[in-house]
Amino acid sequence: SGVFQLQLQEFINERGVLASGRPCEPGCRTFFRVCLKHFQAVVSPGPCTFGTVSTPVLGTNSFAVRDDSSGGGRNPLQLPFNFTWPGTFSLIIEAWHAPGDDLRPEALPPDALISKIAIQGSLAVGQNWLLDEQTSTLTRLRYSYRVICSDNYYGDNCSRLCKKRNDHFGHYVCQPDGNLSCLPGWTGEYCQQPICLSGCHEQNGYCSKPAECLCRPGWQGRLCNECIPHNGCRHGTCSTPWQCTCDEGWGGLFCDQDLNYCTHHSPCKNGATCSNSGQRSYTCTCRPGYTGVDCELELSECDSNPCRNGGSCKDQEDGYHCLCPPGYYGLHCEHSTLSCADSPCFNGGSCRERNQGANYACECPPNFTGSNCEKKVDRCTSNPCANGGQCLNRGPSRMCRCRPGFTGTYCELHVSDCARNPCAHGGTCHDLENGLMCTCPAGFSGRRCEVRTSIDACASSPCFNRATCYTDLSTDTFVCNCPYGFVGSRCEFPVGLPPSFPW
């Protein structure tokens, strides 16, 4: 669809005569009839296949024709057509004399024709005007013409329909050749597809308008590139939705079981070394000068009875000091100035000469010790407490403080590993010599029955359109991760499927 435009510019009829040679009285009141038809090698009679148009009286004899496109559109003359422009044409322009106001052919005098021109040729669609001048014996007509496409038509022959739009059916303007040019933020054949936020994950994200990034089920984050872990996952991560892959030091279905108490809680005090020994279980190896389960107790340096031979110990800021009894000297009163003659052995100890009487040694009766048998035997010296238990003197008796997981007088008994109910999901616990074993109920497996092996909700392939299915272990349900272009709990709905063009 387009328009052939004819701009009449100047008509010269200096003598004011008709084609018959007869003069017009008083002058030739001139109007034009235009016939546009398909190309004919010889312009022939017959219909004006591309249209006809007539002008009012434009002037008398010789005159310039005013461009009147703004005021009613009479010049240039418009010859619209509603077919593909063929690129060739025949044009007939007749100048007629109208003595009165009635311009119908039957109302004109028999010889009212002033002049007639017929041209034929090629004409491409374009904005540029072609200027032409036709001269006969008595008249001259100067005019220009062009073919332009109607609104919304484009291309070399005005055959491409393109109507700019910004709605559900497309977001584009039209290029000069009729091809679509998408508005910013849109893409696709008909510019119906929004361009999502830059970096928005191709599979896991989508958008309904430009610069948006909406996440598909199981994904989160600004660019939908972070998976959502299993609901309740405490110390774990995922690489696909609904996973719970435990961080180092954590275990269990929800990664909430602490396997690295040392790192997570730092229970050992005063620079002690911590060793993990099971779930929520640890051992502290104290530095010298400290004691207690968590090495939280500071040992007095005198507690180890460093002073020999009945020397008394005094704590000092930077250590301790031994006050030696008469006859002894040295840092720990270890050197004697006595001999057996001085009866140095207490509590019934018997004295033996050494080094030719320069020194002596006491042989102590049971329950006494020390170089002079001056000390009662410490019942804890022999480390009677097993499994790292701490020995405590309690007057005439002694007792063992056991580490977690041990009991008995000497901490020699393992507390049942089953006492903690370590088997998840109703598993039955069996104590073994070095650990425990869980017998799992139907639908569960793993060392602690923590792995759900119940019916796979994805087994029935509930997701449509090649979506990926994930099983939600906590609810025995499935989640569909839709491919691009589909939404819905089962990815069953297409997103904005390009409809057939509505025009």
Partner: antibody, heavy 119, light 111 residues
Framework: QVQLVQSGAEVKKPGASVKISCKAS????????IHWVKQAPGQGLEWIGY????????NYNQKFKGRVTFTTDTSTSTAYMELRSLRSDDTAVYYC????????????WGQGTLVTVSS | DIVMTQSPDSLAVSLGERATISCRAS??????????MKWFQQKPGQPPKLLIY???NQGSGVPDRFSGSGSGTDFTLTISSLQAEDVAVYYC?????????FGGGTKVEIK
């Protein structure tokens, strides 16, 4: 009123020529075309061709080309058809009719001229 | 050349009745949405008279009972209510291509 008046009947010998006239009145002669149509006795219509009365451009039916010539005289608003090398099958009524670029068709016809070719 | 075939060759219709004449072209006579088809009436001893042009447009002074229809290759002339003065030979004619050609004619008579 529009009129096309043709010359009278002609009797010609085979091999001769005939020139028929068609005088127009009541309209702008130069704006139109003149067609010539043959009708043999008891037969249908056969188109011979046309001439533009404005610039003299012609279009002939191939069947008659070389034996027929169309001319006009704009000063007298008259169109002519000359047919040469006459044969007996040229015996017919010959009509002139006017036509226009704005497709009404051959809306006015002359009364016809009978040409008889006989030895 | 485009061959125009009319049918029937002759037609006898009662006064006031409908008469229908067909014309078939050997190829389409349409161009740019216009049918280059005309119908003429010729009474004995008279020149032809234009009835219909462009397949369906009435010529000047033609009674309304004459109508034309069709496009492409098949055309019809209809006289809705035959009158005595309609007795004549009717010709179809194409002007799409040179040489312009006429149909063989259909003779319409009163039954």
């Amino acid at each position: 009123q529009v009129q096309l008046v043709q010359s009278g009947a002609e009797v010609k010998k085979p091999g001769a020529s005939v020139k028929i006239s068609c005088k127009a009145s009541g309209y702008s002669f130069t704006a139109y075309y003149i067609h010539w149509v043959k009708q043999a006795p008891g037969q249908g219509l056969e188109w011979i061709g046309y001439i533009s009365c404005y610039n003299g451009a012609t279009n002939y039916n191939q069947k008659f080309k070389g034996r027929v010539t169309f001319t006009t005289d704009t000063s007298t608003s008259t169109a002519y058809m000359e047919l040469r090398s006459l044969r007996s099958d040229d015996t017919a009524v010959y009509y002139c009719a006017r036509d226009y670029d704005y497709d009404v068709g051959m809306d006015y016809w002359g009364q016809g001229t009978l040409v008889t070719v006989s030895s | 050349d485009i061959v125009m075939t009319q049918s029937p060759d002759s037609l006898a219709v009662s006064l006031g009745e409908r008469a229908t004449i067909s014309c078939r072209a050997s190829e389409s006579v349409d161009n740019y949405g216009i049918s280059f088809m005309k119908w003429f009436q010729q009474k004995p001893g008279q020149p032809p008279k234009l009835l219909i042009y462009a397949a369906s447009n009435q010529g000047s002074g033609v009674p309304d009972r004459f109508s034309g229809s069709g496009s492409g290759t098949d055309f019809t002339l209809t006289i809705s209510s035959l009158q005595a003065e309609d007795v004549a030979v009717y010709y179809c004619q194409q002007s799409k291509e040179v040489p312009w050609t006429f149909g063989g004619g259909t003779k319409v008579e009163i039954k």
